[in-house]
């Protein structure tokens, strides 16, 4: 699994790079699964999409997402994993030209086709949690995380730091 050690590896990479803002520090392909090991599958067509959160069949290939890692341009007092008070942020893309977006009004996670530079809604602060898990906090709405609700991805408000370990906002990243 790509958890604590992986996040630390890319956090360390910040020291070796002066790149900030619109250029990613590094990119990484990984399958995304929930804390309970349900797979996340992205079913995109030109005019529609669906994101499945479910137990994947044994013989089926896991979808992968391209995670692009960025260093936040602005120092932060938030709890995001980073270096020198800066946060590590990611964008998540399941296929070329499409990215996960936070729709804070609808509390939903959406897929949008867009060109770079990506809007702020496509950026998530990466948190390195326990048990080799990570969580994704909306850049546009601190305290709101990508989570699982009714077998779908949704935006979930986390009231206190104690709730940061709630299972429905924890995800696993794996190379396989």
């Amino acid at each position: 699994a790509f958890g604590i050690s992986g996040v630390q590896k890319y956090t360390r990479a910040l020291h070796d790079s002066s790149i900030t803002g619109i250029s990613p520090i590094t990119e990484y392909l990984a399958s995304l699964s929930t804390y309970n090991d349900q797979s996340i599958t992205f079913a995109l067509e030109d005019e529609s999409y669906e994101i499945y959160v479910e137990d994947l069949k044994k013989d089926e290939k896991k979808d992968k997402v391209l995670l692009s890692y960025y260093e936040s341009q602005h120092p932060s007092n938030e709890s995001g994993d980073g270096v020198d008070g800066k946060m590590l942020m990611v964008t998540l893309s399941p296929t070329k030209d499409f990215w996960l977006h936070a729709n804070n009004k609808e509390h939903s996670v959406e897929l949008h086709k867009c060109e770079k530079p990506l809007p702020d809604q496509a950026f998530f602060v990466l948190h390195n949690m326990h048990s080799n898990c990570v969580s994704f906090e909306c850049k546009t709405d601190p305290g709101v995380f990508i989570g699982v609700k009714d077998n779908h991805l949704a935006l979930i408000k986390v009231d206190s730091s104690e709730n940061l370990c709630t299972e429905n906002i924890l995800f696993k990243l794996s190379e396989t």
């Epitope: 392909l29 399958s31 992205f42 079913a43 995109l44 067509e45 030109d46 069949k57 044994k58 013989d59 089926e60 290939k61 896991k62 979808d63 992968k64 997402v65 391209l66 893309s93 399941p94 296929t95 070329k96 030209d97 499409f98």
Partner: antibody, heavy 126, light 106 residues
Framework: EVQLLESGGGLVQPGGSLRLSCAAS????????MSWVRQAPGKGLEWVSG????????YYADPVKGRFTISRDNSKNTLYLQMNSLRAEDTAVYYC???????????????????WGQGTTVTVSS | SYVLTQPPSVSVSPGQTASITCSGE??????AAWYQQKPGQSPVLVIY???KRPSGIPERFSGSNSGNTATLTISGTQAIDEADYYC?????????FGGGTKVTVL
């Protein structure tokens, strides 16, 4: 509206060659894996070959390996099937089919064949 | 190579339920799809991912898959449902189809 239009079929002698084309429209062609599926007269469907995003991601059924070559030209929204060393048992209607979903970074073909062309007939006979 | 086995034919009276089976080793570990093909026409996807219907496919078509068998069920069968039906799976980036089942509406 998704449209797939095959062409290039015809009568060819055993050992001969044919090149089939499939012109695609109504969707972002480069985003989808594509396949060729054939159907011999009075028989069932048989998957022939598939292609994902580039020339390295090609897949073939055992009966056509080494004889058929699948390719695509994303600038022309066209899928191809080059068929060499044709045999009588290759006689069939050849359908071009698009994967239901866009390709994912995991690579390979994706789920079922969501859209089909009308087919082009290939007859191998002396 | 992976083999999917279907009954050659199934007969059903109008309004009744037709069930078509598709058997393969550990079929339930794969996602099954079903295609309808009417004479002289191209195949049409009617079920994918075991149970899901593409837009435009009537609700009377449903699917299930467990163990070694996937099943396509047509509830309240109509005359227009008379066709050949093929199951299919994707196995290691290779397409596999069953031999097809001719559904006759009596």
């Amino acid at each position: 509206e998704v449209q797939l239009l095959e062409s290039g079929g015809g009568l060819v002698q055993p050992g001969g060659s044919l090149r089939l084309s499939c012109a695609a429209s109504g969707f972002t062609f480069s985003s989808y894996a594509m396949s060729w599926v054939r159907q011999a007269p009075g028989k069932g469907l048989e998957w022939v070959s598939g292609i994902a995003d580039d020339f390295t991601s090609t897949y073939y059924a055992d009966p056509v390996k080494g004889r058929f070559t699948i390719s695509r030209d994303n600038s022309k929204n066209t899928l191809y099937l080059q068929m060499n060393s044709l045999r009588a048992e290759d006689t069939a209607v050849y359908y071009c089919a698009r994967d239901l979903w866009m390709m994912n970074y995991a690579g390979g073909l994706r789920y079922p064949f969501g859209y089909w062309g009308q087919g082009t007939t290939v007859t191998v006979s002396s | 190579s992976y083999v999917l086995t279907q009954p050659p034919s199934v007969s059903v009276s109008p309004g009744q339920t037709a069930s078509i089976t598709c058997s393969g080793e550990r079929m339930g570990d794969k996602y099954a799809a079903w295609y309808q093909q009417k004479p002289g026409q191209s195949p049409v996807l009617v079920i994918y991912r075991d149970t899901k219907r593409p837009s435009g496919i009537p609700e009377r078509f449903s699917g299930s898959n467990s163990g070694n068998t996937a099943t396509l069920t047509i509830s309240g069968t109509q005359a227009i449902d008379e066709a050949d039906y093929y199951c299919g799976v994707l196995k290691q980036d290779t397409g596999v189809f069953g031999g097809g089942t001719k559904v006759t509406v009596l």
